[in-house]
């Protein structure tokens, strides 16, 4: 996250960190006690079974008692994900156990299925443990920045016609650099307490107003998300599982 600030610890309890070989790699968010939403491109060249999902974290390198760590039992990328264009860049991660909900681990609500994205100019927040500058500086803890929804046609023009209707864009609202950066991928864009966007890609430089940040528009995939969750029973789960609605 560039141009943002460190959040109050555990104030974004839905945030998930996806790590490989002990290093944070992508973000995600908890929507069900067994399921985390992330970006499909995070797993294009990575074996999901080698990854770990950490919930309840603030400073990833600190051994916080609130942290819950899971391996990935299954990773379900959207069947129409296109790496060449990053269309349909969304993935569901099934945890190998059930998240225990509490003050530091909570679910994030999804938008209603096929809901219109927030209007241009709407203020939203994006969070993550990605770099805080183009120098690939790691953050001290979970970071967040306020951004504004940008009209998709304006954004598509900035992106030389590469976008599709199931994407969403944000900008800083001024000429300052504010937005996401490498390793924020998969994290949520939260507008009105719902995950309307999922971090997908940005331009040559983090937060560059010339190439606005691009997200997967979550509302376009809500039906698919719950179809996948419903189709898969929680392995080893004896209690009832909880989902955000």
């Amino acid at each position: 996250i560039v141009g943002g600030h460190e959040v109050t610890p555990h104030s974004r309890p839905y945030m998930a960190s996806v790590s490989f070989e002990g290093h944070h790699y992508c973000g995600g968010f908890l929507i069900h006690t067994h399921w985390v939403v992330s970006a499909a491109h995070c797993f294009s060249d990575r074996d999901p079974s080698m990854g770990l999902v950490v919930l309840g974290a603030h400073a990833l390198l600190a051994p916080e008692p609130t942290q819950q760590t899971f391996s990935i039992a299954a990773a379900v990328s959207h069947p129409d994900f296109q790496p060449a264009t990053q269309a349909n860049d969304i993935c569901l991660l099934r945890l190998n156990g059930s998240a225990v909900l509490g003050p530091a681990v909570r679910l994030l609500r999804l938008p209603r299925r096929n809901a219109k994205p927030p209007a241009a100019g709407t203020r939203c927040h994006v969070s993550g443990w990605g770099f805080v500058s183009d120098f690939e500086e790691p953050p001290p803890g979970l970071m967040e920045v306020e951004v504004r929804i940008l009209d998709l046609s304006v954004c598509n023009s900035s992106w030389q016609g590469q976008l599709n209707p199931a994407m969403l864009c944000t900008h800083s609202g001024d000429r300052r650099r504010r937005g996401f950066c490498s390793a924020d991928s998969g994290g949520p864009l939260v507008c009105g307490r719902r995950a309307h966007g999922l971090v997908s890609f940005s331009g040559l430089w983090c937060g560059d107003p010339k190439t606005p940040d691009v997200y997967t528009q979550v509302s376009a995939f809500v039906t698919w998300i719950w179809d996948v969750v419903r189709a898969s029973s929680s392995p080893g789960s004896t209690g009832r599982s909880v989902r955000a609605v």
Epitope: H41, T85, W159, F201, D208, K210
Partner: antibody
């Protein structure tokens, strides 16, 4: 040792096509953006195109937009520049370059490949 | 697009001289400027990034400074191998743009 090796240059008629390749070694291709930069004979440097580390997004200079396409095959550690509808003003040495950090500079460059557009 | 204007376009200097090349951006680019050295028939080599950071392996006689719109590359004591063309480049706003180059020749 980091290496970038371009190939595919040559003489082509106006309106023709060429595909340049940039074979990378010594670094993780999927961890770094790749750029093409060109230099017309006796002139300065001009940035042409970029492809992100994931290969999922691209950006082009206005002068080549709609005619050139940058792509990458991460399994082969190779980037490509497909050049269509070539013009005399596209004549240049084409370099591929690797990003330092998040594109703060170009830290490694290939040796360049000459593209000549002439009838 | 941001224009990068270098001056002078060429200069003559002797070994041991202190050489200064300037680069002016058409709008604020913060400290996102890199400097490169290029010799005839060769690819450019990175010297300085983010206005003042010396790239690994580059001799300490090279230094960079500036922020906003005005930037400087200084060679404190010119060596025979430094005769080349030098380019600045902004890395702040898409697309990246280069200066037109400054050719450093032997006096």
């Amino acid at each position: 040792e980091v290496q970038l090796v371009e190939s595919g240059g040559g003489l082509v008629q106006p309106g023709g096509s060429l595909r340049l390749s940039c074979a990378a070694s010594g670094f993780t291709f999927s961890g770094s953006g790749i750029h093409w930069v060109r230099q017309a004979p006796g002139k300065g440097l001009e940035w042409v195109a970029w492809i992100s580390p994931t290969g999922g997004n691209t950006y082009y200079a206005d002068s080549v937009k709609g005619r050139f396409t940058i792509s990458a095959d991460t399994s082969k550690n190779t980037a490509y520049l497909q050049m269509n509808s070539l013009r005399a003003e596209d004549t240049a040495v084409y370099y591929c370059a690797k990003s330092l950090f998040h594109n703060v500079a170009f830290d490694y460059w290939g040796q360049g490949t000459l593209v000549t557009v002439s009838s | 697009d941001i224009q990068m204007t270098q001056s002078p376009s060429s200069l003559s200097a002797s070994v041991g001289d202190r050489v200064t090349i300037t680069c002016r951006a058409s709008q604020d680019v913060s400290t996102a400027v890199a400097w490169y050295q290029q010799k005839p028939g060769k690819a450019p080599k990175l010297l300085i990034y983010s206005a003042s950071f010396l790239y690994s392996g580059v001799p300490s006689r090279f230094s960079g400074s500036g922020s906003g719109t005005d930037f400087t590359l200084t060679i404190s004591s010119l060596q025979p191998e430094d005769f080349a063309t030098y380019y600045c480049q902004q890395a702040n706003s898409t697309p990246p743009t280069f200066g037109q180059g400054t050719k450093v020749e032997i006096k």
